[in-house]
Amino acid sequence: ATKLTEEKYELKEGQTLDVKCDYTLEKFASSQKAWQIIRDGEMPKTLACTERPSKNSHPVQVGRIILEDYHDHGLLRVRMVNLQVEDSGLYQCVIYQPPKEPHMLFDRIRLVVTKGFSGTPGSNENSTQNVYKIPPTTTKALCPLYTSPRTVTQAPPKSTADVSTPDSEINLTNVTDIIRVPVFN
């Protein structure tokens, strides 16, 4: 059975989820990346994507979601601002990288948002103030940004081994210091 690891974030309404998903720098720096939610019994829902090709350190905002791809560090930074209770759920970072074989990583983000004022932010970077100002360089982006005809595809974790498939996604690992909750299926 495939072992999936969940990394749990417990935050309050109004706070900001701040996730850093790492990837293999040489392979995927310019690949389009996406942020998805996986609701119980449903297919993954793509919520936001970087541009294609992904631009370095160029914030893309879709609603309350901000994606920034740091090519130099091999990091996709995902922020969800002004969190609401209904944002609670299981999320994952993915890379659109056809037609190469997937490099499988299995960490997903379990977000739990509870009611209550977030208070004064402390040293935890996830505890951000209620009001969040989007940087002026942020662009509004359709997701995904495809050229025509559309050919970009992905694939979720299938096994711990590398699996050769013509069209695939790469699930990225979140590398912030948080609780790991192993989940087995």
């Epitope: 939610i37 019994g41 829902k45 595809t153 013509p166 996604e169």
Partner: antibody, heavy 119, light 113 residues
Framework: QLQLQESGPGLVKPSETLSLTCTVS??????????WGWIRQPPGKGLEWIGS???????YYNPSLKSRVTISVDTSKNQFSLKLSSVTAADTAVYYC???????????WGQGTTVTVSS | DIVMTQSPDSLAVSLGERATINCKSS????????????LAWYQQKPGQPPKLLIY???TRESGVPDRFSGSGSGTDFTLTISSLEPEDVAVYYC?????????FGGGTKVEIK
């Protein structure tokens, strides 16, 4: 260019099992950006989603048909299939296979195949 | 299940005139975090499969003429054909893909007056 093509018998007897196959060409079924599904349209009526499957075999069914539906995938043949058991005349419809992707909905469709349930 | 209700059932419009189709969902299909509505519009011509026109309620699919536009949010949506062309004669369906089971509206038949 990705194409989907449905195949299977056009006539099925009541109480039997309807079996259809969708062959994917011009692209790989082995990708979970896409889910592969079945939709049907009774004569002169609207569209009804039957269910969808991922390349890894995760299935999602319409509760109204769940007890009678099985969708399966064969990645080696780049195909996915529909089985609908205990059919009645109400299952007479054009059956479409389609590709689903969450930002888009169902963006590529097969031409459809007509299935008539009759003795 | 989310029930999708379309109106009118049929619509006769003169060539070059505007056609407006409405779609109402029984619950919101707006996803809060990205402010996107998971609603699509399809065009189906006789003897053909449906063709995706609009996704995310207002984004035109690649290759779709700009006379087609989608608007609305939450539970109320509109497909507008700004200037009807002969090839636009078809049945149009809205569909929610926010939650399972995916559901379609009953369709609106657009004809030339």
């Amino acid at each position: 260019q990705l194409q989907l093509q449905e195949s299977g018998p056009g006539l099925v007897k009541p109480s039997e099992t309807l079996s259809l196959t969708c062959t994917v060409s011009g692209g790989s079924i082995s990708s979970s950006s896409y889910y592969w599904g079945w939709i049907r349209q009774p004569p002169g009526k609207g569209l009804e989603w039957i269910g969808s499957i991922s390349y890894s075999g995760s299935t999602y069914y319409n509760p109204s048909l769940k007890s009678r539906v099985t969708i399966s995938v064969d990645t080696s043949k780049n195909q996915f299939s529909l089985k609908l058991s205990s059919v009645t005349a109400a299952d007479t419809a054009v059956y479409y296979c389609a590709r689903y992707y969450s930002p888009y909905g169902m963006d590529v469709w097969g031409q459809g195949t007509t299935v008539t349930v009759s003795s | 299940d989310i029930v999708m209700t379309q109106s009118p059932d049929s619509l006769a419009v003169s060539l070059g005139e505007r056609a407006t189709i409405n779609c109402k969902s029984s619950q919101s299909v707006l996803f809060s975090s990205n402010n996107k509505n998971y609603l699509a519009w399809y065009q189906q011509k006789p003897g053909q499969p449906p063709k995706l026109l609009i996704y995310w309620a207002s984004t035109r699919e690649s290759g779709v003429p700009d006379r087609f536009s989608g608007s609305g949010s939450g539970t109320d949506f509109t497909l507008t054909i700004s200037s009807l062309e002969p090839e636009d004669v078809a049945v149009y369906y809205c569909q929610q893909y926010d939650s399972l089971p995916f559901t379609f509206g009953g369709g609106t038949k657009v004809e030339i007056k």
